[in-house]
Each structure stands twice: as structure tokens, then as C-alpha cells.
Amino acid sequence: MSITGISPITEYLASLSTYNDQSITFALEDESYEIYVEDLKKDEKKDKVLLSYYESQHPSNESGDGVDGKMLMVTLSPTKDFWLHANNKEHSVELHKSEKPLPDQAFFVLHNMHSNSVSFESKTDPGVFIGVKDNHLALIKVDSSENLSTENILFKLSETHHHHHH
């Protein structure tokens, strides 16, 4: 599956939380970023993530004029020059500093099996999704479309009124 344009079709800032309303937070430790899944105290500020949406052509045999068969890919950046990456060997989700063009590991196919939540499928390992495991983000294998509704791969995006990207 190939990205059809080098520019995102849209971008926006949102805070990311689990289906159970735990927040995804990012902390700089020893010159690298760690990702946590945690309950925030009341009025504690949520971390923001810049979501960039790209169109991608799905590799299919569908007939037609190319209008059909597109999907949305996203990259997620909580801070300048850092993006979430899928480490398929370690089944982990990591924050890495990257330059554009971003590697395929930084792209995730967007799904939403509920109207108010989304899931992120690894571009480099189809059927594997960002999920929550032991209070951390991990890559989780999903066997069938029925399991796309399992709560540990569902995330909520809540809008933010801050338009800067720290």
C-alpha cells in the first residue's frame, strides 16, 4: 500500500486516551521518550498528539477509476520531530526522532469500529494494532474483524483548543 501524496490531507491536535479513559502520556527520560498509560489526576493537563492523515491506495484488484480503494494512514507526533513507531520485532510501540520522509514504521492504518473511537493498524505488519498491555502501549495481533472491537486496541481522540505543537 502506497501513500498517494507526500503531504497530509489534514492534521489536528488531540489528546489520546484508552477506551477506559486512561491517558496516553509521554515523558522524556535519559534523552529518550517513554510512553505511559495512566490515570491522570483531576485537572492534570493531558498530553497532545499531532495526528497527520495521509491517503493511501489499497493494493486490490478492484475495478474502477482509482477513486475507490483508498484508506487513511496516520502518523502520531507528541512532540516536534518525534513520531510513534511500530517495532514489529519487539511487539512494541516506541517514540523515535525521524526526518521526513518518515519510515513505514511510523504509519498506521486508521480504523474506527465505533463512532467515538479509533484503532491504529501497523502499516508494516497488517493485522497488528497499537494496544494497551500492562500500562504500556504494545503491538497486539488481532485475528479477525470481530476482535476489532476489543477494548484494548480502542482509543479516544479528544479535541484540544491549543493549536501549537510543542
Partner: antibody
Amino acid sequence: EVQLVETGGGLVQPGRSLKLSCKTSGFTFSSYWMYWIRQAPGKGLEWVSSITPNGGNTYYPDSVKGRFTISRDNAENTIYLQMSSLRSEDTATYFCAKGHYYYTSYSLGYWGQGSLVTVSS
Amino acid sequence: DIQMTQSPSVLSASVGDRVTLSCKASHNINKHLDWYQQKVGEAPKLLIYFTNNLQTGIPSRFSGSGSGTDYTLTISSLQPEDVATYFCFQYNSGWTFGQGTKVEIK
């Protein structure tokens, strides 16, 4: 070529039921959200229902909740709208539409030509 | 629920005019907004998605812009074939259409 063809419309008495079908072709049906949208004569568009690609989740506005049921048959590439307890205000052309992208509920990429439902005694 | 309000309800302009249609959301919809064109007796057709992306096959005289709660569809040079009703549609939270703007030729 993407095609969506609605059938099943017609004249029905208030309080009765009717089932619409939308047969599709030309795309990987099981990967797309599908929708029903209606338009009363001379009026605007109203979203009526949505269904996820695997059929596991369905959504309705309050105006039809509890009376209308959307479903899909991924083997037959068809969606359905079962309408019960019909009211005169349900009189409209009913369009089916497919999502613009695989897997997501964003944008209505293609529409059928519509099927007219008239609720009158 | 998010409400979408379009203005004006009817717009009358001359061929070649630059035409601007407005759509206002009751809450921030994060650019999750489309524009649809519906000609008399036809099904609606997707023109613009995600606020400013032109659907394949749509003439470049159509463009979209906006953010937050305020969105605009612009026709840079109105043509006779653009006579139609235009609907905005949000999908940020649930799904809601605006009531439509009817575009006529003077």
C-alpha cells in the same frame, strides 16, 4: 465501477413496516462503513443510520431509534433498512451510501439513486 | 449533538461570479467536514472532503476552507452546471448535515 442500487420502496400505511435493500458492486464491500440517508420531498438531507464494516455496531439518530434497524450481509454485498411503526414524517427518498475510505466512518464517497417511501393512509 | 447551520439558504449569482457558501458547526469539528452537491432529481455527490480536499473528477473551481467551527465552500467562477443545492456534512462526532444552500443563476 462502484454501484449502489436501492429497492423496496413504495406506499405503506402508518404503523406498518417496510424493508429497504441496497445491493452493491464494484468495491470490497466488507471493508466499508455503510449508511442510509433520507430526504423528505423538497427538504434537506437527514442521516438515518450507519453500520460498521463487520456489522458489529450500528448507529441511529433519535428520530428513528427503536423503529429502524440497519443490517448487512457481507456475502451478498447488501445492506438493509428494516423500518417499523412508520409515520407520515418518514416519507422520503432513502439513499444508501458507502464510506469514502476503507475501515473509517469519514465521508460518503458514493450514493445510490434512492428509493421513495411514502407513508400515507 | 452537533448542529450545522448553512448560510445563505438561497444564493443568486451571475455566471463567472465568485460564490461563497458558509457552514457553521455548534462545536469544533476538527476539519471533519465535507461538501456535497445535489442537482434536481439526482443523488448527492461528494465534492470536497476533510474541509479542503477535492474529490476526483470535480472541477478545480471548487475549493473548501475552514477550521474549528467555521467552514466555507467557494466556487471561483460560477458556471451554469453549478446550479444545485450544496450541503455541508460533519463526521467528527456522529453525522450531521447542514440544511443546504440553493445556488441559482441570476
